[in-house]
């Protein structure tokens, strides 16, 4: 593991006094009962508290809500309860934060049964001032803001109503009824599915996909025989029923619904789903769940079109019951994602790939590391990191992985090292590189956060006793300090730091227990003092991202360039800053066949990097041409990786072939190809095509 | 002390052929890929070659591609250009270069150089 | 390839004096590259890697800036000892390629 506190740790001098100085303590007049806690707008330093203590009597529930605000990143709060009337809020609405900096927050009260409609609080001063607005209708969901103007909203009704508000909240109108999803997209559009049947649940795969570009003067069909739809990058997908009413399959459309082409994968049953588990404006990682209860399936790559997909990864790990997924996009660095499979002997996996899906490997465990009792040969194993999958089975793992696009090639994790994911006690592991190369951080699990841009780790030992404890590291969690930060420990419930990892400062949140009563309690860290100076041009050095072989004159090369980035050295302590922007250096490299992904028709045999034309096509293959128009249906047998910037190099040019004759398909009747019947999908929730959970871009 | 020293330089004909060597000395000489520059009188310079620590990466100049073979030896410390089908512009001095031990990295260490004249 | 251009080719300098000496690539090349100075009759020797740092016993006079596709080479106060011919030298992408030098006279 890294050197403990004793061996060449001493970086921080006197950071005891410092840290002392820049600690602050806040007693919420709380009983305890839940707490969450939003930031409003980036760098202003503006948290909201919300506290809620709920009695559930049999007929209605009696509680409490106390607002508190802070505009100094947590070290002191106001009570501002009766800007809010004393009103109860419901939590399951949380607190809607606006867009951006837009300083807008909105706030669900809870009213009685018999009223008409419900009531929000809304403020668009950074939560100095809030306006009581009662609402013609009982939402259901949070409101939801526009990405373009925060000052449209769009909710749904208990009896399944579209709202849309202009005027942030103020007035409202309907303008659908029997909604049963809704999304805003690009542009101030909004896309929902509507029965007009009037049944959301009985009735998915006969919705309709509709779309307003007006706020709801006018509407679109834009597809039909819809079972659920989403939204990525630059994306619209739908998983529509087929002919005979058994089977879905996606289809997608780059022109919000304008057109659609059926995407070249395997149709799924009622007993299935499909889920995007990422997407950008330049392509998208679809997951298709396997038959029967397997609690797998297999990843796929689309191309830029979205239509023609690559296999990426088979038994990727996805519980068909929870809807668990292990599968995280690394961000702070290009390219990275790591998932689980489950392997043929039932035990769980990690695996990792470099470039963005094309390959998955094994994550090399730490250097100096021993292989655990899952282990088959004592020498040879792999670092096994816990995720989603490892939390919804009730493992002792308090937190996903952790990176930041800002703090380059950092990557933080729980984990174990063998040949698969262990039940045993994990510790805390940490890559500097992106998850090339890993080391053992800290022993036993721990809550981990990143502050100014990587320049500080600070962590808090997982324990069912109370801690006063907390670990901080300068070096990317090589060394580890610790600092006693209240004499009298509390029971933790959590770290909270400003999204976006820039901040200096730390909250650590618990709550105290005596006799009779146990209260909210907050620390609030800040580091500024430990970090004395600011950043200076030579406490960088060049890190050239992906290197794995220096003398290749390829190194790095990943989606056809390659990227040198400034970083901090480890030795320097200073402060990277709050304006801190990544210095990163892009270099076209050659192209080579690896750049190139198989067209529509063309595969590519196993250990050969070649694409060949398949002998005929046949199967779901066809589905893909259904809807195709010609230039859909001419191509070199190649097509560029979405995102590939190679130039020169391996330029492979095949015949032109017109793959129009091989196209015969009654997947469905030729008189259905219209943009109402070859649409989108939508849905209301539920197990199958989750388009929604944890960060999963869409899941049916 | 590091140190490069080339050899094998003279004057030949067009369409002979010559073999220059480079004895490293005061450095791991097996954990460094390694490099032919070359600068025509009173020219600028122009790289020629370059080979990896195991001899895995091989790349040459388009100039030279077909006609000279690099090649080294661990074991002797020593870095090896055959040149065949010289031709009147091949005609320079020749240096031996190590490339530091980083990706993209810069030519650390140089030799004295050798002249080769191509001439009838 | 790469063409890197360096300028001014030609540069009569009294001592004392601040030498800039700019190289331009034909595309982003990031930090890759090099500075070498070859004096004459003599082979070259490296001043400045990775288009900013100093390589062990060059004297502090020389410095380095820039990244992506243009960059410099400065020296600070010159001395009689630095007239020599100044190469730039890519290693970003193959062929490797050097600029066509910059000769530094001592007035």
């Known amino acids: 593991s890294a050197p403990g506190e004793d061996e060449e740790c001493g970086r921080v001098r006197d950071f005891v006094a410092k840290l002392a100085n820049n600690t602050h303590q806040h007693v919420f007049d709380d009983l305890r009962g839940s707490v969450s806690l939003s930031w409003v707008g980036d760098s202003t330093g503006v948290i909201l508290v919300l506290t809620t203590f709920h009695v559930p009597l049999v007929i209605m529930t009696f509680g409490q809500s106390k607002l508190y605000r802070s505009e100094d990143y947590g070290k002191n709060f106001k009570d501002i309860t009766d800007l809010i009337n004393n009103t109860f809020i419901r939590t399951e609405f949380g607190m809607a934060i606006g867009p951006e900096n837009s300083g807008k927050v909105v706030l669900t009260a809870e009213v009685s049964g018999g009223s008409r409609g419900g009531r929000i609080f809304r403020s668009s001063d950074f939560a100095k001032n809030f306006v009581q607005t009662d609402l013609p209708f009982h939402p259901l969901t949070q409101m939801m803001y526009s990405p373009q103007n925060s000052d449209y909203l769009l909710a749904l009704s208990t009896e399944n109503g579209l709202w849309v508000s202009k005027n942030f909240g103020g007035k409202w109108e309907e303008i659908h009824k029997t909604v049963c999803l809704a999304k805003w997209g690009r542009k101030g559009t909004i896309f929902f599915t509507a029965n007009h049947n009037g049944s959301c649940s009985n009735d998915r795969g006969m919705l309709e996909l509709e779309r307003t570009t007006d706020y709801g003067k006018s509407f679109k069909t834009v597809a039909s025989k819809i079972y659920s739809f989403g939204l990525g990058g630059k994306f619209l997908f739908a998983s529509v029923m087929t002919g005979k009413g058994t089977l879905r399959a996606i289809h997608v459309s780059v022109d919000d619904g304008d057109t659609w082409n059926m995407a070249q994968l395997p149709p799924v049953g009622h007993e299935q789903f499909y889920s995007i588990l990422a997407a950008n404006d330049e392509m998208v990682f679809m997951h298709v769940d396997e038959p029967g209860d397997s609690g797998f399936g297999t990843i796929y790559v689309s191309d830029d079109r979205g239509t023609v997909y690559s296999k990426s990864l088979e038994r990727h790990l996805y519980t068909t019951t929870g809807g668990e997924t292990d599968f995280i996009n690394v961000t702070s660095l290009r390219g990275v994602f790591t998932t689980s499979i489950l392997a043929e002997d039932k035990s769980v996996q990690s695996v990792i790939s470099f470039d963005q899906g094309g390959e998955w490997v094994p994550l090399r465990k730490p250097a100096d590391s021993k292989c655990d009792a899952t282990a088959r040969d004592p020498e040879k194993c792999s670092l096994h990191i816990h995720a989603a999958y490892s939390i919804a089975t009730g493992l002792n793992v308090p937190m996903l992985p952790l990176s930041e696009p800002n703090a380059v090639g950092l990557v933080l994790a729980h984990g174990s090292v063998g040949d698969a994911i262990s039940v045993m006690r994990p510790d805390v592991y940490v890559s500097d590189d992106g998850g090339y190369t890993w080391i053992k951080a800290l022993e036993g699990p721990h809550y981990y956060t990143i502050l100014d841009s990587g320049g500080i780790i600070v962590a808090i030992e997982h324990s069912s006793r109370p801690i006063n404890v907390i670990k901080f590291s300068t070096d990317e969690g090589q060394c580890w300090q610790t600092y006693t930060f209240t004499r009298d420990p509390i029971y933790f419930t959590g770290l909270a730091s400003e999204p976006g990892a820039r901040s200096m400062n730390i909250s650590i949140w618990g709550f105290t227990e005596s006799f009779l009563t146990s209260q909210w309690v907050s620390y609030t860290i800040d580091f500024k003092d430990i970090l004395e100076r600011n950043c200076e041009e030579k406490d960088y050095t060049i890190w050239l991202a992906h290197s794995t072989d220096p003398e290749d004159y390829e190194d790095g090369c990943i989606l056809g360039y390659k990227e040198q980035f400034l970083r901090l050295r480890k030795s320097s302590v200073c402060q990277n800053g709050r304006d801190y922007v990544v210095t990163k250096q892009p270099s076209i490299c050659l192209c080579s066949l690896e750049d190139f992904l198989c067209d529509f028709g063309y595969y590519r045999p196993e250990n050969d990097s070649k694409c060949v034309e398949q002998p005929e096509l046949k199967g779901h293959d066809l589905e893909f041409c259904l809807y195709g128009r010609e230039e859909h249906l001419t191509t070199n047998g190649y097509r560029k990786i979405p995102g590939d910037k190679c130039q020169g190099g391996v330029n492979p040019v095949r015949e032109v072939k017109d793959l129009k004759k091989k196209c015969t398909s009654n997947f469905l009747s030729p008189e259905k190809q219209n943009s109402k019947s070859n649409g989108s999908a939508g849905g209301s929730g539920g197990l199958n095509d989750i388009f929604e959970a944890q960060k999963i871009e869409w899941h049916e | 002390e590091v140190q490069l020293v080339e050899s094998g330089g003279g004057l030949v004909k067009p369409g002979g052929s010559l073999r220059l060597s480079c004895a490293a000395s005061g450095f791991t000489f097996s954990s460094y890929s390694m490099n032919w520059v070359r600068q025509a009188p009173g020219k600028g310079l122009e790289w020629v070659s370059s080979i990896s620590s195991s001899s895995s990466y091989i790349y040459y100049a388009d100039s030279v591609k077909g006609r000279f073979t690099i090649s080294r030896d661990n074991a002797k410390n020593s870095l090896y250009l055959q040149m065949n089908s010289l031709r009147a512009e091949d005609t320079a001095v020749y240096y031996c270069a190590r490339r530091g031990s980083g990706s993209y990295d810069a030519f650390d260490i140089w030799g004295q150089g050798t002249m080769v004249t191509v001439s009838s | 390839e790469i063409v890197l251009t360096q300028s001014p080719d030609f540069q009569s300098v009294t001592p004392k004096e601040k030498v800039t000496i700019t190289c331009r690539a034909s595309q982003s090349i990031g930090y890759s590259l090099h500075w070498y100075q070859q004096k004459p009759d003599q082979s070259p020797k490296l001043l400045i890697k990775y288009a900013s740092q100093s390589f062990s016993g060059v004297p502090s006079r020389f410095s380095g800036s820039g990244s992506g596709t243009d960059f410099t080479l400065t020296i600070n106060s010159l001395e009689a000892e630095d007239a020599a011919a100044y190469y730039c030298?890519?290693?970003?992408?193959?062929?490797?390629?050097f600029g066509g030098g910059t000769k530094v006279e001592i007035k």
């Open positions: 030298h890519q290693s970003s992408s193959l062929p490797l390629t």
